[in-house]
Amino acid sequence: FGISGKHFITVTTFTSAGNIGEDGTLSCTFEPDIKLNGIVIQWLKEGIKGLVHEFKEGKDDLSQQHEMFRGRTAVFADQVVVGNASLRLKNVQLTDAGTYTCYIRTSKGKGNANLEYKTGAFSMPEINV
């Protein structure tokens, strides 16, 4: 039998885009774990020292957060136990574009996945009937 925390768990991300100046979401899901206090979520960005966001023991820990993300991030805390590690990002900036890693550790094991986050001035296409 395996030892708790030594297994790999499935983490899934989706490439997404954010509108500059608006609020966005970086999507990440993982195998659910009812033990909230045992779940650690870390969001990292390639090329950035420090974390984008960290959630552990049932609450945020922003002590290692990089300055560029200060006051701009949140997880959906009430959805973590059902496997939602998605990150809300306030006031999307051009410099937010890049490769992010969603790292998860639970009592079942650990895993991570990357996503490409694109930023720009996107608009809904007009459809003329």
Epitope: D23, S63, R88
Partner: antibody, heavy 120, light 107 residues
Framework: QLQLQESGPGLVKPSETLSLTCTVS??????????WGWIRQPPGKGLEWIGN???????YYNPSLRSRVTISVDTSKNQFSLKLSSVTAADTAVYYC????????????WGQGTLVTVSS | EIVMTQSPATLSVSPGERATLSCRAS??????LAWYQQKPGQAPRLLIY???TRATGIPARFSGSGSGTEFTLTISSLQSEDFAVYYC?????????FGGGTKVEIK
């Protein structure tokens, strides 16, 4: 429930440093989802955000005051403090401390406020 | 910095009537806006955040709406305890800024 209480001198001389402390009770200043902020309100006027601090010590200040402001935290006492140097009469205000959400960043709750008058 | 403008500066309303307060941002703040109530000699009290979410313990007669640059706080039926000054605040970008306030007074 969580309560905040400001304390410090009510009168400061021009060019000196204003020093205030906010004591948090009914909860821990180490609560991870919150910053701890200072806001001021000159008599009969509106509100101005001064800056905030996280329990780990990282700070962010209003650029208009950045050169004169220092916010610090003492987790062992469950307190955070404000220092504003080189004060003038324009710094006369009611100073409030408040808990600030990490995002959304609303202020709730607030301390009762303390009036600081800058006068010789 | 983002400038928040509130109107009117003073609103005279009779008890039981509806009050509509406006707040405009100099640039889009998405839904990153809060409303506060302040009575004389007291600290502000959070009413609304996220432009439309009522804070804990706030009566249903208070409602917020809007996004982008235009926001509204509505008090559906004014009670005696609602006469106060109301401030909007944006937290879309640093530095966080407040509007100049709207005083709701008894007509």
């Amino acid at each position: 429930q969580l309560q905040l209480q400001e304390s410090g001198p009510g009168l400061v001389k021009p060019s000196e440093t204003l020093s205030l402390t906010c004591t948090v009770s009914g909860g821990s200043i180490k609560s991870g989802s919150y910053y701890w902020g200072w806001i001021r309100q000159p008599p009969g006027k509106g509100l101005e955000w001064i800056g905030n601090i996280y329990y780990s010590g990282s700070t962010y200040y209003n650029p208009s005051l950045r050169s004169r402001v220092t916010i610090s935290v003492d987790t062992s006492k469950n307190q955070f403090s404000l220092k504003l140097s080189s004060v003038t009469a324009a710094d006369t205000a009611v100073y409030y401390c408040a808990r600030e959400g990490s995002y959304p960043n609303q202020f709730d709750p607030w301390g009762q406020g303390t009036l600081v008058t800058v006068s010789s | 910095e983002i400038v928040m403008t509130q109107s009117p500066a003073t609103l005279s309303v009779s008890p039981g009537e509806r009050a509509t307060l406006s707040c405009r941002a100099s640039q889009s703040v998405s839904s990153n806006l809060a409303w506060y109530q302040q009575k004389p000699g007291q600290a502000p009290r959070l009413l609304i955040y996220g432009a439309s979410t009522r804070a804990t313990g706030i009566p249903a007669r208070f409602s917020g709406s809007g996004s982008g640059t235009e926001f509204t706080l509505t008090i559906s039926s004014l009670q005696s305890e609602d006469f106060a000054v109301y401030y909007c605040q944006q937290y879309h970008s640093f530095p966080f800024t407040f509007g100049g306030g709207t005083k709701v007074e008894i007509k």
